[in-house]
Structure formats: C-alpha cells, structure tokens
C-alpha cells in the first residue's frame, strides 16, 4: 500500500466495570477494541469501513494501560494500511467491547457486549508527529494518539508519489524526502539514466554508456575524442577533420607518401638513366637505349615488348627477335590468320563475322565470354557488387548476392527492420527505436518481449498516462487510473486541451 494509519491506544478507564446498557460485567469487563476507519462523513453512519478495520485481542479488565507491542497478538500501535492517495480527511470509530470468551480472538465469541464507543471526524496531514486525544463519557475514558505515515517507497503530502531507489539500466538514483529523484554520482537526466561522460569529452565527437567514459565516434581518437584520425594510409601528413591527409613539408600525393625530392635523396635510377621528381612513385627513370625496368636496371630483351600476337612465341636473336606462329597464323608478328569462318574459330557459341572479303574473321561473343575467339569466361563477381559483407555467387548468365543476417536487396544494400522478425510475444506491438526493437505489451503481459505473464499487481506495468496514479481494484488484473486535472480516459491518455509544450510526434 501507499500509507498506514497508525492508532496508539494508551489508557482505558472503566472504574465501575459497566456496559453501555447499564449492566455490570461479571467478574469484570474483559475489554477488546474494534476500530473502523472510513472516508470523512459529517455525520458518521453505519456501512463499510472504506479505509480499513481492525480488532484487538483482550487488552485488559475494566481499567488498564496499553503498552506498545511490535509483533504478534495485541500489537500496539494498531496498523491500518491503505493503497490510495491519502485524502487528508477521515472518520474513525473506536468501540470498546466486553467478551466472556477467547482472549486472543474475542471477535469470534458469542455474547460480546458494547462498553462504549467514540467517533472522531476531521482532517489529518501525513507526518511523523502523533496527534494525542482523550475522550470521556459518563462511564469511561480513552486516551489514544494517531498519525498517518507513508509506506516504504511512497512519498509526498498524500503518499501518492512512488519512488524506489535503483541502480540499473533504467535509472541510477536515490529518493529525496519529497519523492523526487536524486541522481547517483556520474548520472543525470529526468530518470538519471544518462551517464555523465569523462570531463572534457568532446560533445559532438565523443559519447559514453557509463560515467567517466569517453567513446569516440568514427573519425576521432584520443582520451577526449578531440583528435581527428587522418586518412587510412596517410604517411607523412596530418588532419584537421577526419579522414584528411594534409602533407608535411617535402611530401606529396594522396597519402603524402611521395618524396618530392626523391631523386636527390635516393638516386634510384641505374645505368646512366635520367631521374625526375614526378610520377606515381614520386620519381620516374628515363632509360638509355638498351635498358628497361622501373630503375633501368634490366638489359633490354628484344622480346620484352611481347611483339608476337595470337599466341606466337618470341625467340631472342642477336639484334632482333623471331616469332614462331601457332597453326593458322603467319606474318612477322603472327598477325595474319589463315583461318576463316569456315574453320569455326569462335568458342562458347560466339558468332563469326567475315572480314577482308573472307580472308579473316572476327568473333562476336555471347554474354559472360570474351577474348578474340570467345575463349575466356567473364567473372561477374570481380567488381565486388555485394554490400554489407554479402557473398557473391556466379549463377549461369547472372550473379547473385547471398546476404548476411539483417540485410536484404539485390546487393544486400537494405537493412531489415528489427521488427520484421516479429520479436514481440502475446500480441505485443513492436516499435523500431534507436537502440533496437521495443515491445508495447497488451494487458496481462510485460517484459522486453511481452514474454512475462502478469499475475500480480496490475499497476506494475505502469498503465496510466500523464502522471496519473494507478490503483489496483478488487481483482488482481483490474486497475483504476486517477487522472490529474486536465486529463480524461480510462488510462488518463487524453489531454482535454493541449498546451504548446505537449510532446507532439507527427
């Protein structure tokens, strides 16, 4: 419940041992009390004890002092717990009865007789201070005190504010005396669920998932994520924004790996060749006749330029070369074909077209084949067409991408929604949020995936909107939402009029 009405009985005096009807008790009035607490009534009436009721065992005979007792039978102060917002007003009926029967359970005994009763109506604020009172009638006097306090985890003027300290994924806080949250060190936000990052952690380039942490976003590094990462492979350069490569003095090229003075520093060109500071490696060697190679380090073979065509093999001669032609070809470089379309030279279903009045030919290749005679198969996976780690597979005339889990599309370029896998059980509704799928559960279910069947407090799932107070009803699955001013609906989900600050989502 949200609070407890406590009644402390202190002393009861019935010196003559009389009942309310004027008869005397024999041998004395064995006295127990019935307490009925209900909503405020200007005139107290019979009817249910709407805020609760309790009975005591026999506490004494005729006149006696009631001692405080914290457990077992005859507990004092008496506890009347409630689980609603304390309204601040009440009616209390205290009846003293005589029983001839069982001391411990006098309620069950026949022949109980009323000694006296008192009725108190008024207002009472929640607080720790006891209100003391004494009531007299012609025969009896009762001294007592009472107060209303909030149960554990309930706070505020009407014990309506629930606050339970926690230190988990949903929040990191303790509760203030008024029920407001007090964040644990290192946490902030309305529900103390946002970590305070390492002091100085860059606001845009860094973030954290726990206090005093600084995780860098792509392109940034350093303890405070304030240092950019240069372009991958940047050798002699720096950056002012991520993936940049601004070259240091004397270096050039996309990766600042080309020494602009390479010729002077390294003298790479051999055999009397000329070096110039240019070209893809930062230098170029211009060779003297008879030499070749990147650094002019190779004596030139006459066959080095691959002069023989159509598969002819080259043989070095003293100052020249000679081509040995395969069957069907002739000429100094095997450039002439003796084959015609009549020899069916085109492979893999290629179409033969005659040229030069039938003395030569050309092959037109079908899809997936290339080469002068359509002898080479085209590999359609060489261009790496599959995104997001998809596997490329050649399938006849086409190719397909086999996607990793979570991706789809011809090229695996589309993300599959987390909700597409229907993760919510028991008819729960899935919402794709930034940190993954979240399920909204139907009544009677809870949990991340609506997998937990609720068999206890129907208010535990927090069904009420807009700060309404939830009360459980007569059966476990019933609840009632007590709406704040300006809201209606069985869950207080409808604002009557909308202020500009209302959270609109288009």
């Amino acid at each position: 419940g949200s609070g407890i009405f406590q009644l402390r009985l202190q002393e009861f005096v019935n010196q003559r041992g009389m009942l309310a009807n004027g008869q005397s008790c024999e041998p004395g009035c064995r006295t127990f009390f019935r307490i009925c607490l209900k909503h405020f009534q200007a005139t107290f009436s019979e009817g249910p004890c709407t805020f609760g009721n309790v009975s005591t065992p026999v506490l004494g005979t005729n006149s006696f002092v009631v001692r405080d007792k914290n457990s077992g039978s005859g507990r004092n102060p008496l506890q009347l717990p409630f689980n609603f917002t304390w309204p601040g007003t009440f009616s209390l009926n205290i009846q003293a009865w005589h029983t001839p029967g069982d001391d411990l359970r006098p309620e069950t005994s026949p022949g109980n007789s009323l000694i006296s009763q008192i009725i108190i109506q008024g207002s009472l604020a929640v607080g720790k201070i006891w209100r003391t009172d004494e009531q007299n009638d012609t025969l009896t006097r009762l001294s007592y005190s009472y107060r209303v306090i909030c149960s554990d985890n309930y706070y505020g003027e009407s014990c309506s504010r629930l606050c339970k300290k926690r230190d988990d994924h949903f929040g990191h806080y303790e509760c203030q005396p008024d029920g407001s949250l007090s964040c644990l060190p290192g946490w902030t936000g309305k529900y103390c669920d946002q970590p305070i990052c390492l002091s100085g952690c860059h606001e845009q380039n860094g973030y954290c998932s726990k206090p005093d942490e600084c995780i860098c976003r792509p392109g940034w590094q350093g303890r405070l994520c304030n240092e950019c990462i240069p372009h991958n492979g940047c050798r002699h350069g720096t950056c002012s924004i991520p993936w940049q490569c601004a070259c240091d003095e004397g270096w050039g090229g996309l990766f600042c790996d080309q020494d602009l003075n390479y010729c002077t520093h390294h003298s790479p060109c051999k055999n009397g060749s000329t070096c110039s500071n240019s070209g893809p490696k930062g230098y170029t060697c211009t060779c003297l006749p008879g030499y070749t190679g990147e650094h002019c380090e190779l004596g030139l073979s006459k066959c080095a330029s691959n002069p023989c065509r159509n598969g002819g093999s080259c043989k070095d001669q003293e100052n020249s070369y000679h081509c040995l032609c395969p069957p069907g070809y002739y000429g100094q470089h095997c450039e002439h074909s003796t084959l015609t379309c009549a020899d069916s030279p085109c492979f893999n279903g290629g179409s033969c077209r005659e040229r030069n009045q039938g003395s030569s030919y050309a092959c037109e290749c079908p899809p997936n084949f290339t080469g002068s005679n359509c002898e080479k198969k085209v590999d359609r996976c060489t261009s790496n067409p599959c995104a997001n780690g998809g596997q490329c597979q050649n399938r006849g005339p086409s190719r397909t991408c086999r996607c990793r889990p979570g991706f789809t599309g011809t090229h695996c370029e589309l993300h599959i929604s987390d909700c597409a896998r229907s993760p919510c059980a028991h008819g729960g509704t899935c919402h794709d949020l930034e940190n993954g799928p979240v399920c909204t559960c139907p009544a009677g279910f809870s949990g991340r995936r609506c997998e937990v069947r609720i068999t206890h407090d129907a208010c535990a799932s927090g069904p009420c909107f807009n700060g309404a107070t939830c009360y459980t009803g007569l059966s476990p699955n019933n609840f009632v939402c007590n709406c704040p001013y300006g809201f209606v609906g069985s869950r207080c989900e409808f604002p009557v009029g909308l202020p500009p600050s209302f959270p609109w989502v288009a």
Partner: nanobody
Framework: EVQLVESGGGLVQAGGSLRLSCAAS????????MGWYRQAPGKQRELVVG???????HYADSAKGRFTISRDDAKNTVYLQMNSLKTEDTAVYYC?????????????WGQGTQVTVSS
Amino acid sequence: EVQLVESGGGLVQAGGSLRLSCAASGSTFSNYAMGWYRQAPGKQRELVVGISSDGSTHYADSAKGRFTISRDDAKNTVYLQMNSLKTEDTAVYYCYVPVKVAGLEYAYWGQGTQVTVSS
C-alpha cells in the same frame, strides 16, 4: 514507423453530416486508445472524443449527442460520425494515438483534415 492518415473532411452546410476516418499503419492498434482532436484558427487544440483501449468513450460537452466515435480493429481504423454540424465545428480535425513504450509516453498525430461548416 507509425503513420496516421485522416480523410473525410470537406465543406458542408450547417445541420449536415460528415464521417471522418483515420487509418493507422505501422502497428496493430487494437491495444491502444485512439482519439479525435480539433483546432480552430487562433485556438488551442482540444479533445473532441476519445476511445480508450478498453472500449470506454469520452466525449467533450460540445460533441455529446451529435458526434459518435467507433473503431474497426481489423482495418486499424477509427471513425468520427458528425451529425447536426454547426458553424462553430469548423476546424482542422486531427487523429491521435497515445502510446507507452518502455515507460515513455509518445503522442502520434495525423496531418489533419479540414472541416468547414457554412451557414
């Protein structure tokens, strides 16, 4: 992504009738409350009628006896039947779905449909 699309608005003479529809997509709405709000020029948005997830209805005083809300969960659609229309009913009418996700409250709104009642 939840989307609400209203239709059925238009120009009607005082005393006439209109039926507004709000089709919801991106979720199953049988477990949710749905409602109709309206906003006249220069005024705040106000509740016309809401239907809670348990089926109970909540009408503004100005709508009682003239307007009726109903829902078809199979079609994910909520309707507003408006009879005996008055000039003061002229406004943009918005569909509204309140949702609680992981303890946080979200309010989904449609783009609105204009209702004009002429004298």
